[in-house]
């Protein structure tokens, strides 16, 4: 029947690595959209530039990153996106009114090590976790 | 002398709640822009809309959420922004050209449970991490 | 408490449609699966297919290029048609639910009591 | 697909006598997807089992089910009257879904 025969053509569509989500028939090809896609940039931010430069001893500033881009359907594995963003980009393929397309964003983010005086003006050396982009990816 | 007595005054004016990152003198107030702030907001989805109906036995959809806002300076501290994204609202604040805002994505995902039929036929009742917004923040 | 009636032709003549209606009473047929079931005088149990409430079918690979199982959620009933029909398709027709949930699948209940089907010209 | 012989054709038995029905599966059932049916003569099926050991509502005590993978059994403890007649199997692990050809359990 032309039911079953869908069913079994919709499942033939379905990708083969399956890891993030089986039931997603997200084409793994390139974007179709003209923007750019979701991407790791260049950013080094000064803390001068901050107005952090008076209590802030070390460093200068730092390699930070940030993340842009089109999170388009279809999603490429290498967007790093969840099951969510995944289900999130068809529906708004299907149906744009309904909710945005998911954005770009950092999956992976480093710590970094700031030396600076506190209130007290003692010198402290902290580690300040998720300061540095490692990764983006569709959220 | 006039130079460390300039940083100790600057440094005075640093915020004294700085779990999120202590050098960031980023205000704990409403957001300055019109928009609505980052949050989490209802989306059902129906795996009927999605095509999915003829391999996906059970459910027949399920809350998913989706999350939407605006992540403006000054960040509040329900945002759940990352140090990172403290960092690039206020670069952005600075100068807009520079960077984008930080965007508004999920902070926590849960799973949920899904019965399908697979390649071969075979029904298969399996977690799918990552599939429900359970909260949203600025990354 | 729920219960299903098939309803039709007691007899079909040899290479017509065999057409059959499931009501069901008791509760709504949202939000379950729907299936036709055969059993052959003297013989097995065959299943034949179903249909979501939604739209979606099933069919058993061997009969699937005769069968259209629909449904009319507005009337609470569910059809079988069966096209092309010879003396081998004479049999009890029942139609059943299937639960419909991650924890609840596959099995049938309840069943309808059952209708003879005679494939004879 | 997935085809279930079950064992033996016919089970001749006195009433409060135990009675053992094997349904065997020629590839494993996936998550014990499997149910036990009972009929009468002139009447519908009736689901005692699913989930291979669950028993349905108003289904009594004697009737049980075990087994996984390739290999299940229905036991019915001590034979009552009313449960002379045919039992099968159908799987539900696997599209399409199927049924064992049945055993008849006959007073002896």
């Known amino acids: 029947s032309t039911g079953s025969k869908q069913r079994s053509q919709n499942r033939s569509k379905t990708p083969k690595n399956q890891e993030a989500l089986r039931m997603a028939n997200v084409a793994e090809n390139s974007s179709s959209d003209q923007r750019q896609a979701c991407k790791k940039h260049e950013l080094y931010v000064s803390f001068r530039d901050l107005g952090w430069q008076d209590w802030i001893i070390a460093p200068e500033g730092y390699a930070a990153y940030y993340c842009e881009g089109e999170c388009a359907f279809p999603l490429n594995s290498y967007m790093n996106a969840t099951n969510h963003a995944i289900v999130q980009t068809l529906v708004h393929f299907i149906n744009p009114e309904t909710v945005p397309k998911p954005c770009c964003a950092p999956t992976q983010l480093n710590a970094i090590s700031v030396l600076y005086f506190d209130d007290s003006s003692n010198v402290i050396l902290k580690k300040y976790r998720n300061m540095v982009v490692r990764a983006c990816g569709c959220h | 002398s006039t130079g460390s007595k300039q940083r100790s005054q600057n440094r005075s004016k640093t915020p004294k709640n700085q779990e999120a990152l202590r050098m960031a003198n980023v205000a704990e107030n409403s957001s300055s822009d019109q928009r609505q702030a980052c949050k989490k907001h209802e989306l059902y989805v129906s795996f009927r809309d999605l095509g999915w109906q003829d391999w996906i036995i059970a459910p027949e959809g399920y809350a998913a959420y989706y999350c939407e806002g605006e992540c403006a300076f000054p960040l509040n501290s329900y945002m759940n922004a990352t140090n990172h994204a403290i960092v690039q609202t206020l670069v952005h604040f600075i100068n807009p050209e520079t960077v984008p805002k930080p965007c508004c994505a999920p902070t926590q995902l849960n799973a949920i449970s899904v019965l399908y039929f697979d390649d071969s036929s075979n029904v298969i009742l399996k977690k799918y991490r990552n599939m429900v917004v359970r909260a949203c923040g600025c990354h | 408490q729920v219960q299903l009636q098939e309803s039709g032709p007691g007899l079909v003549k040899p290479s017509e449609t065999l057409s059959l209606t499931c009501t069901v009473s008791g509760d709504s047929i949202s939000s379950y699966y729907w299936s036709w079931i055969r059993q052959p005088p003297g013989k097995g149990l065959e299943w034949i297919g179903y249909?979501?409430?939604?739209?979606?079918?099933r069919y058993n690979p061997p009969l699937k290029s005769r069968v259209t199982i629909s449904v009319d959620t507005s009337k609470n009933q569910f059809s079988l048609k069966l096209s092309s029909v010879t003396a081998a398709d004479t049999a009890v027709y029942y139609c059943?639910?299937?639960?419909?949930?991650?924890?609840?699948?596959?099995?049938?209940?309840?069943w309808g009591q059952g209708t003879l089907v005679t494939v004879s010209s | 697909e997935i085809v279930l012989t079950q064992s033996p054709g016919t089970l001749s038995l006195s009433p409060g006598e135990r009675a053992t029905l094997s349904c065997r599966a020629s590839?494993?059932?996936?998550?014990?997807?499997l149910a036990w049916y009972q009929q009468k003569p002139g009447q519908a099926p009736r689901l005692l089992i699913y989930?291979?050991?669950s028993r349905a509502t108003g289904i009594p005590d004697r009737f049980s089910g075990s087994g996984s993978g390739t290999d299940f059994t229905l036991t019915i403890s001590r034979l009552e009257p009313e449960d002379f007649a045919v039992y099968y199997c159908q799987q539900y692990g696997s599209s399409p879904l199927t049924f064992g050809g049945g055993t008849k359990v006959e007073i002896k």
């Open positions: 059943a639910r299937i639960c419909s949930s991650t924890s609840c699948w596959g099995w049938f209940d309840p």
């Open positions: 249909i979501y409430y939604s739209g979606s079918t």
């Open positions: 590839q494993s059932v996936s998550s014990s997807y």
């Open positions: 989930g291979a050991s």
